[in-house]
Amino acid sequence: KAMHVAQPAVVLASSRGIASFVCEYASPGKATEVRVTVLRQADSQVTEVCAATYMMGNELTFLDDSICTGTSSGNQVNLTIQGLRAMDTGLYICKVELMYPPPYYLGIGNGTQIYVIDPEPCPDSD
């Protein structure tokens, strides 16, 4: 059986442009190396937001310039995306790959619709 990935349907970003959600996968095997990718789907275009590979039991580390951070616990990954603006509203898909040992397994979530509302500028005070 292929791998199942679950993620929330909808998340609202904070006023500071931060959105967090959990990506959970049902691992069919005893993977030691897992890759998690967040993809954004707009129309038929799919772009990579961020990706991280981690060893089971170790922390999830994204690249220094990544807009994502995350922590892992068992078969759950807690993902946080920051620096979001209204134009970034869209469907964010969690993709999980069991990289090692073979066989490779793929799991793709149905996506989390992240809504981002830009904060109103503060009115000038006299």
Partner: antibody
Framework: GVVQPGRSLRLSCTAS????????MHWVRQAPGKGLEWVAV????????HYGDSVKGRFTISSDNSKNTLYLQMNSLRAEDTAVYYC????????????WGQGTLVTVSS | QSPGTLSLSPGERATLSCRTS?????LAWYQQKPGQAPRLLIY???SRATGIPDRFSGSGSGTDFTLTISRLEPEDFAVYYC?????????FGGGTKVEIK
């Protein structure tokens, strides 16, 4: 090219327009008049590779991301390795192949 | 993959079947013409690839999948392959040849 059984051959495939390290890169082959057979994949930064059962231990996939070039080192070649070999790019949403090379015919014969 | 060969006339409907050993929706369909590399038609069992006409549609889940060509055009006569990509090794079906009756 034509190569004798037991000998070695290295295939290469150079791509442009995308960054190798963002994708899984694959080799797929097709024996004359037959169907498609997946051969091997190299993932992202190159640290993980997976192979089809028929080539495991004989073929090695590698890449040079700085050159956007994919390689397939084929050792201990057999007559049944005769095929057109395609390089192919796995898509972001999975290892289905949206871009294919034109293919190169490898004939193993004495 | 079944049938091995499908003999049909232009304008007819073609229904191709694929049964996989892996239960998932990670299934793709390709079209291949003689002397050419395969061309991606469908991924994720039912999503059309970019530039593929809407006469091509994919359906199914679990282990049983179908590719339907609603009205065959002359350029649709070719060999069609399914492929599962949920678990390595990524296996292809044996192919179905759609030929002119």
């Amino acid at each position: 090219g034509v190569v004798q059984p037991g000998r070695s051959l290295r295939l290469s495939c150079t791509a442009s327009g995308f960054t190798f390290s963002n994708y899984g890169m694959h080799w797929v082959r097709q024996a004359p008049g037959k169907g498609l057979e997946w051969v091997a994949v190299i993932w992202y930064d190159g640290s993980n590779k997976h192979y089809g059962d028929s080539v495991k231990g004989r073929f090695t996939i590698s890449s040079d991301n700085s050159k956007n070039t994919l390689y397939l080192q084929m050792n201990s070649l057999r007559a049944e390795d005769t095929a057109v070999y395609y390089c192919a790019r796995g898509e972001r949403l999975g290892s289905y192949f949206d871009y294919w090379g034109q293919g190169t015919l490898v004939t193993v014969s004495s | 993959q079944s049938p091995g060969t499908l003999s049909l006339s232009p304008g007819e409907r073609a229904t191709l079947s694929c049964r996989t050993s892996v239960s998932s929706s990670y299934l793709a369909w390709y079209q291949q013409k003689p002397g050419q590399a395969p061309r991606l038609l469908i991924y994720g069992a039912s999503s059309r690839a970019t530039g593929i006409p809407d006469r091509f549609s994919g359906s199914g889940s679990g282990t049983d999948f179908t590719l339907t060509i609603s009205r065959l055009e002359p350029e649709d006569f070719a060999v069609y392959y399914c492929q599962q990509y949920g678990i390595s090794p990524f296996t292809f079906g044996g192919g179905t040849k759609v030929e002119i009756k």
